[in-house]
């Protein structure tokens, strides 16, 4: 199974509606189905057309909380089972909570994607939010990864940083486990300096309404909301 | 696009003191850090303080705590710097600039200030 | 305070000669250096971002290293618009502070 079309992200205001495609292709034409933060999604309905060997599934939601939907495309060739998957999330517009309020715990990176990046033994921030925080952030971290080696050689290792730093945010441990956020400074320097043509492209889609998965990770948080390493060097994280 | 535009020349007597001004466009003024650098005739740069716009926090160099003071006002995107008991080594250009060292930098014209009797 | 020492204070030299301005950190500031340009009349230009990132736009003749406390600016082949001042910024911690700049001139 492949995925021809994956869904892309969006920025919505609370209580719209919002459409994700996702079109897969494989002998024999695939199955398709949804994930809402690591469970079968619970609410919106499913349409799926197939034509040709390809199978087009949209699935429509209406939106009253952020979350990740990963699009699964299965089939079965004699013996053998084929899956893709494709992820994006669902954010609301001024939606999201300060950090400390959000519900987690601290446990040991044991993903692959960020291996390179994050430090040996770091301890990450994992969100209950999700039903299977380690699988569905690894995932995010994946779907963005792949699409980050279309960008220039000086953006895509400050890219990645900034991502699986994003992502899996270092951990505070204590009574109330802590995601730290990046530095202000240094979503700036991938932003602006590192990453500045990619970050123009990404503007532009923004305006339009557009988001790519990986673009709109990039872009959350708004590096002005960050805390500064000069102003307060033990409430972020230096990459 | 980015622009930084600097109030005009000033000439100002010793023990006085001078505001200068930086009027922000083309950005979202609350979100990047305005720093203040100063280049005495024929001298190097030197680094007088920065402000947060959003909130208004600021840090300055030692030489001119006490003697310095840095505000924002949102409603009209500017920034302003104060410098109080001026003296004959306090004439220079003054530079308001966004974001030295780690976004994109621009540059507001500069403003001369010269401290005369 | 972090003390940066730039060597030398001036230079002269001819078109199409390697120059290497040296800038010294009183402590560590990791790579938390930027190069400026500064032509008479005119407001300084950023070249070098992060120590030996290059600015958009900046000729591939310049080039930055160094981490640390020891950092080099380095023209490859000088050209004529080359001959300016150049400052080197840490921007570690406040206060930050300008090394006390290099005057390039024709030899």
């Known amino acids: 199974a492949r995925i021809l079309r994956a869904p892309e992200s969006h920025n919505v205001t609370f209580g719209s509606f919002v459409t994700l495609h996702c079109t897969a292709t494989g002998i024999p034409v695939p199955t398709i189905t949804w994930i809402e933060n690591g469970n079968a999604v619970s609410s919106g309905s499913i349409q799926e057309s197939v034509k040709d060997r390809v199978i087009d599934s949209r699935l429509q939601l209406f939106i009253t909380k952020p979350g990740l939907y990963t699009c699964i495309a299965t089939n079965k060739h004699g013996e053998k089972f084929s899956t893709a998957k494709a992820a994006a999330t669902i954010s609301i517009a001024e939606w999201s909570k300060p950090q400390k309020d959000n519900k987690g715990y601290c446990a040991q990176y044991r993903g692959e994607v960020c291996n390179a990046v994050l430090a040996k033994d770091a301890l990450v921030f994992l969100n209950t939010s999700y039903a299977d925080p380690e699988e569905a952030q690894e995932l995010l971290v994946h779907t963005a990864w792949n699409e980050l080696k279309v960008v220039s050689p000086v953006c895509r290792p400050a890219a990645e940083a900034l991502l699986c730093n994003h992502i899996f945010q270092e951990c505070s441990p204590g009574v109330v486990p802590t995601p730290i956020p990046i530095c202000r400074e240094y979503c700036l320097a991938v932003k602006e300096l590192f990453c500045a043509k990619e970050w123009l492209v990404m503007e532009e889609k923004t305006h339009r309404g557009l988001y790519r998965s990986e673009m709109h990770l990039l872009s959350v948080p708004e590096c002005s909301k960050l805390p500064s390493m000069h102003w307060d060097p033990t409430a972020c994280a230096r990459l | 696009q980015v622009q930084l535009v600097q109030s005009g020349a000033e000439v100002k007597k010793p023990g006085a003191s001078v505001k200068v001004s930086c009027k922000a466009s083309?950005?979202?003024?609350?979100?990047?850090?305005m720093h203040w650098v100063r280049q005495a005739p024929g001298q190097g740069l030197e680094w007088m303080g920065i402000?947060?716009?959003?909130?208004?926090?600021?840090s300055y160099a030692q030489k001119f705590q006490g003697r310095v003071s840095m505000t924002s006002d949102t409603s009209t995107s500017t920034v302003s710097m104060e410098l109080s008991s001026l003296r004959s080594e306090d004439t220079a250009i003054y530079y308001c600039?966004?974001?030295?060292?780690?976004?994109?930098?621009?540059w507001g014209q500069g403003t001369l200030v010269t401290v005369s009797s | 305070d972090i003390q940066m020492t730039q060597s030398p204070s001036a230079m002269s030299a001819s078109v199409g000669d390697r120059v290497t301005i040296t800038c010294r950190a009183s402590q560590d500031i990791r790579n938390y250096l930027a190069w400026f340009q500064q032509k008479p009349g005119k407001v300084p230009k950023r070249l070098i971002y992060?120590?030996?990132n290059l600015q958009s736009g900046v000729p591939s003749r310049f080039s930055g290293s160094g981490s640390g406390t020891e950092f080099t600016l380095t023209i490859s082949s000088l050209q004529p618009e080359d001959f300016a001042t150049y400052y080197c910024?840490?921007?570690?911690?406040?206060?930050?502070?300008f090394g006390q700049g290099t005057k390039l001139e024709i030899k």
């Open positions: 402000i947060n716009p959003s909130g208004g926090s600021t």
């Open positions: 910024l840490q921007h570690n911690s406040y206060p930050y502070t």
């Open positions: 992060i120590a030996s």
């Open positions: 083309g950005y979202t003024f609350t979100s990047y850090y």
């Open positions: 600039a966004r974001e030295l060292g780690w976004g994109s930098d621009y």
